[in-house]
C-alpha cells in the first residue's frame, strides 16, 4: 500500500489555509523513521524534506491550484509516493462594491486632500479597482491589489474636481460598479467688488443709486452685506451667480465711504471702499454726487 495525501479542506477558498497530511499505510511502523516532502506540480513545498508528516499552507491563492502529492523516505533511502490530488482553489467573486469619500459626505474645501475609497464586502485574490469621473466615466486610475479596499487620492481639490464619481471592482468574474458619489468642492469667497450705478452721470438727491456687490469666486449661496461708513445698510443673498444689489434713495447725508462684504460660511471678505461725495451748490441748483 502506498502513501495517502489528505487535504483539508478539500475545496479551499482563496486566502484561507490548507493542511496537507502525508498518511502512512497501516503496515508501516512509526512515522518517526521517515522523512517527508510535499510537492505541487513537481516543485517541492515548504521546508523540503522534514520529519513532520504535516504541512500547512497559510494562504492559498487561485494560482496555487494544481496537482499535489507527498513522498516519504525510509532510513534505507526507499522512497514511497502518494497518489496525486488535484486541489482547486475557489475564488470568491467581488460583491457589494461601494465608494466612500474622505472627508465624508463628499464635501471638500478647495485646496484640501480628497480620497475616494473603493471597497468590496467580499472577494478574494487579486482585485482590480478602477475609479471613474463623470456619469460617462473617464478612467482616472487602476490599481490591482490583494485587499478589499483601495484608495484614489486627489492631493489638492480644485473646482474642476466637482463631479460624479464611481469605482469598479473586478477579480475575474466580471466588473462590478459601485453607486455614484457626488463631490462638492467648497470655495471660500474672493474679495468682492463694489460697483455703484447711478441713473445719470451726475446723480441728484432723490435718485436711486444701485450698489452692486459681487464676489467672482466662491461657493453659493453667498450673503452680501452693504455698509455706509461701517454702518449696515442692508443685506441680500445670491443663491447662484451674479452677485447682489442694494438700492439706495439719495439724500444729502449719503456722502461718504461705501463697502460691501461677501460671506458664504467659509469665510468673509470685505470690498475696497468707494467714496461718494456730494457737492452742495449754492442757490436752487441740486446737490450733485461724484465718486
Amino acid at each position: 500500500a502506498g502513501l495517502l495525501l489528505i487535504v483539508s479542506p478539500s475545496h479551499p477558498t482563496e486566502g484561507s489555509p490548507v493542511n496537507l497530511t502525508c498518511k502512512m499505510p497501516s503496515l508501516q511502523s512509526s512515522d518517526a523513521q521517515f522523512q517527508f516532502c510535499f510537492f505541487r506540480d513537481d516543485q517541492a513545498l515548504g521546508p523540503g524534506w522534514s520529519s513532520s508528516p504535516k504541512l500547512q499552507i497559510a494562504n492559498m491563492w487561485k494560482e496555487d491550484s494544481g496537482s499535489y502529492w507527498c513522498e516519504a523516505q525510509t532510513m534505507a533511502s526507499k522512497v514511497l509516493r502518494s497518489w496525486r490530488s488535484q486541489i482547486n482553489v475557489h475564488r470568491v467573486p467581488v460583491a457589494d462594491v461601494s465608494l466612500e469619500t474622505q472627508p465624508p459626505g463628499g464635501q471638500v474645501m478647495e485646496g484640501d486632500r480628497l480620497v475616494l475609497i473603493c471597497s468590496v464586502a467580499m472577494g478574494t485574490g487579486d482585485i482590480t479597482f478602477l475609479w471613474y469621473k463623470g456619469a460617462i466615466g473617464l478612467n482616472l486610475q487602476t490599481k490591482t491589489q490583494r485587499s478589499l479596499t483601495a484608495e484614489y487620492e486627489i492631493p489638492t481639490a480644485r473646482e474642476s474636481d466637482a463631479e460624479q464619481y464611481y469605482c469598479v471592482a473586478e477579480n475575474g468574474y466580471g466588473p462590478r460598479p459601485s453607486g455614484l458619489v457626488s463631490i462638492t468642492v467648497r470655495i471660500p469667497v474672493s474679495r468682492p467688488i463694489l460697483m455703484v450705478r447711478a441713473p445719470r452721470a451726475q446723480a441728484v438727491v432723490g435718485d436711486v443709486l444701485k450698489l452692486h456687490c459681487e464676489a467672482l469666486r466662491g461657493s453659493h449661496p453667498i450673503l452680501y452685506w452693504f455698509y455706509h461708513e461701517d454702518v449696515i445698510l442692508g443685506s441680500s443673498s445670491a443663491p447662484s451667480g451674479g452677485g447682489a444689489s442694494f438700492n439706495l434713495s439719495l439724500t444729502a447725508e449719503h456722502s461718504g465711504n461705501y463697502s460691501c462684504e461677501a460671506n458664504n460660511g467659509l469665510g468673509a471678505q470685505r470690498s475696497e471702499e468707494v467714496t461718494l461725495n456730494f457737492t452742495v451748490p449754492t442757490g436752487a441748483r441740486s446737490n450733485h454726487l461724484t465718486s
Epitope: Y132, I136, Q164, V168, P177, G179, S182
Partner: antibody, heavy 119, light 112 residues
C-alpha cells in the same frame, strides 16, 4: 425588484404648470442618475435631462431649459419633473428611466405619464 | 446636436425572415474616452422602451441571440436573424456620447 412608478395622467390648461413624479424602489435611490424622456403622440423619443438624487444636481438638454425643472427627494426616493408655461406642444407621454453607469444604458423605465394640455 | 437618422421608417417582414435596421449619426459618436455609447431600444404599443443592445454590440441580459448590433463611427446596424411575432414594435437607436443625447426617429417592424 427594481421599479419606477410614475404618477397618473394629467389634463391641464395652457399656461399652467404640472409636476410629474417617479417613485423608485428596489435599489439605492442615490446610487444612479434618473433621466426623463419625452414622447409626443405618434412620434419619437426626446431626451430631456437627468438628475442625480444624491445631491439633487440636474443636467438639462438646452432645448428644455426654462421649460423643465428636475428635482429629487431622497427621503421618499422620488424624482420629480416640473413643466411650466404649458402649451399644446407639451402634450406628450413623459418617461423616467434609470441609467446604469459603467455599462451605460437605461435598464429600467417608468410606465410613462400622459400629459394633455388643453383649454 | 447629433442627428440620428434611422432607415427604413417602416420595415414589413415575414415571420422567420431576417430584418436589418440602419442608424446613421450626423457626426462620430465615439466618446473622448474611446467608448461608443450607441444603444438600441424596442418599444411596443402602450409600453415603455426596452433595452436590447448597448455600446454598439453588447446584448442586454435576457435578450435573445437573434438580436445583434454592429457598426462604428457614424454607421450602425441592428439585425434580427429570425423575426418572431414578439419582436414587432418600434425600434429606436440612441446615442449617449454627446450632450444632448439623442434618439433616432424610429423604425416600425411590422408583418408583411
Amino acid at each position: 425588484q427594481v421599479q419606477l412608478q410614475q404618477s397618473g395622467p394629467e389634463l391641464v390648461k395652457p399656461g399652467a404648470s404640472v409636476r410629474i413624479s417617479c417613485k423608485a424602489s428596489g435599489y439605492t435611490f442615490t446610487s444612479y442618475n434618473i433621466h426623463w424622456v419625452k414622447q409626443r403622440p405618434g412620434q419619437g423619443l426626446e431626451w430631456i435631462g437627468w438628475i442625480y438624487p444624491g445631491d439633487g444636481n440636474p443636467k438639462y438638454n438646452e432645448k428644455f431649459k426654462g421649460k423643465t425643472t428636475l428635482t429629487a427627494d431622497k427621503s421618499s426616493s422620488t424624482a420629480y419633473m416640473q413643466l411650466s408655461s404649458l402649451t399644446s406642444e407639451d402634450s406628450a407621454v413623459y418617461f423616467c428611466a434609470r441609467r446604469i453607469h459603467y455599462y451605460d444604458y437605461f435598464d429600467y423605465w417608468g410606465q410613462g405619464t400622459t400629459l394633455t394640455v388643453s383649454s | 446636436d447629433v442627428l440620428m437618422t434611422q432607415t427604413p421608417l417602416s420595415l414589413p417582414v415575414s415571420l422567420g425572415d431576417q430584418a436589418s435596421i440602419s442608424c446613421r449619426s450626423s457626426q462620430s459618436i465615439v466618446h473622448s474616452n474611446g467608448n461608443t455609447y450607441l444603444e438600441w431600444y424596442l418599444q411596443k404599443p402602450g409600453q415603455s422602451p426596452k433595452l436590447l443592445i448597448y455600446k454598439v454590440s453588447n446584448r442586454f441580459s435576457g435578450v435573445p441571440d437573434r438580436f445583434s448590433g454592429s457598426g462604428s463611427g457614424t454607421d450602425f446596424t441592428l439585425k434580427i436573424s429570425r423575426v418572431e411575432a414578439d419582436d414587432l414594435g418600434v425600434y429606436y437607436c440612441f446615442q449617449g456620447s454627446h450632450v444632448p443625447w439623442t434618439f433616432g426617429g424610429g423604425t416600425k417592424l411590422e408583418i408583411k
